[in-house]
Interface confidence: low
Amino acid sequence: WPPPGTGDVVVQAPTQVPGFLGDSVTLPCYLQVPNMEVTHVSQLTWARHGESGSMAVFHQTQGPSYSESKRLEFVAARLGAELRNASLRMFGLRVEDEGNYTCLFVTFPQGSRSVDIWLRVLAKPQNTAEVQKVQLTGEPVPMARCVSTGGRPPAQITWHSDLGGMPNTSQVPGFLSGTVTVTSLWILVPSSQVDGKNVTCKVEHESFEKPQLLTVNLTVYYPPEVSISGYDNNWYLGQNEATLTCDARSNPEPTGYNWSTTMGPLPPFAVAQGAQLLIRPVDKPINTTLICNVTNALGARQAELTVQVKEGPPSEHSGISRN
């Protein structure tokens, strides 16, 4: 039986403590002594399950001793003070530090009291997202890449987009032992409509307060898509100048515009001004098919427009821009 008056002297500690790879962590451990209880602590000891010997000892007269003096430190224990706080700080946390530790108080008259603590080693991943610049392929290709490097446990990567697309996610061991690098490719059939749009990579990890969102601006290289605007089918003799515009979307930007007709060069009443074509007043009806040919680094594309200038009053129908 224990001596008279001996109550519940217990060691208090969390069952699990998280710590970050490379950082320091404190394993908290306290001796809880009831009010009327008397206890004398002569030693504090830390040991790791599965390893022989102790990793840290605080002796009543000798002070602290460590198996790895540069990596361990008693936080509060001091010579000449009551040994009630055995909390141990570990520096430069490694993956192999993960495991079960026993914190033990050598007391009198209660004897030894101990508790087990599970140290969980986490690694906060570094996250990057980058565009994979592509051309029109007609088949699904990676258009964005999101990498969460060196997480422990592995980060969760999801993609958010109204463009559709399919993720392709893989994992490899991280450079630091026990960590994982997660790579997620966002795969879609490239189209001109996708160029310049955004997709968002969402990275979730238990080390983050909130998910990290990384936006990728997609790049699709494509030849020009061409149309001609400015004609409303209501052009009449005697009206003022009108302007047609060659509207081109492309990536990279157009490098040249060339105006012609199906019959060859432009007639005298049509004057090319880059992407615009000035149509001067004419004195007789015309029916001409105009061609705008647009070039960029990937090729050339054209659009055609048949323009008619008819007899009749340029009354309220007129769609020509007047000077």
């Epitope: 490379g22 570094q126 990057t128 990498v147 490097t149 893989s170 490899v172 061991p173 450079f175 630091l176 690098t181 790579t183 490719l185």
Partner: antibody, heavy 116, light 107 residues
Framework: EVQLVQSGSELKKPGASVKVSCKTS????????MHWVRQPHGKGLEWIGG????????SYNQRFKGRVTITVDKSTSTAYMELSSLRSEDTAVYYC?????????WGQGTLVTVSS | DIQMTQSPSAMSASVGDRVTITCKAS??????VAWYQQKPGQPPKALIY???YRYSGVPDRFSGSGSGTDFTLTISSLQAEDLAEYFC?????????FGQGTKLEIK
Amino acid sequence: EVQLVQSGSELKKPGASVKVSCKTSGYTFTEYTMHWVRQPHGKGLEWIGGIHPNQGETSYNQRFKGRVTITVDKSTSTAYMELSSLRSEDTAVYYCARWTGDFDYWGQGTLVTVSS
Amino acid sequence: DIQMTQSPSAMSASVGDRVTITCKASQNVGTNVAWYQQKPGQPPKALIYSASYRYSGVPDRFSGSGSGTDFTLTISSLQAEDLAEYFCQQYQSYPYTFGQGTKLEIK
């Protein structure tokens, strides 16, 4: 533009040491692991080891353990690889390479010749 | 260590030919394989990552396939500038290992 620029060729005697540098630019040095790979003339590639610039943690190929030391100088974004106790079979082109799972950028290579 | 065995060690082909290089891993490496092209006097250049995805800027005549232990690099229509040595590499586990290389010559 990512660039890895290595130091010049070295001629060493057996038993000596060599230290090769790799100065980087165009990216954040501490965000990527730097590795070293060597290639004897006309032969294949052999991974030597690597270092994480942030924490200085290293990983080495056991074949070179004890003879190789990889370090970094964060202030100049430079990685170093030192190989000691050189022997003739260490004659090779030594490359630094940035790691992204695979090696996406390589230095131009440094020829180390070991000859008496 | 994981061995990466490449074949053939050397080959000759004509412009326009379809060329296939294989790489066999001594144990499962998933899809954690990269392919590199090395031209004479130059460092290696990454072509393929994760076994089958081309790096941006790499011509689409280059393609990779495979998973587990068997991997292939294919050049669909050989060009004169493809004269080089090609290497596979596993990055599933340390130490990273490379194939011994395939020297490709143009007939």
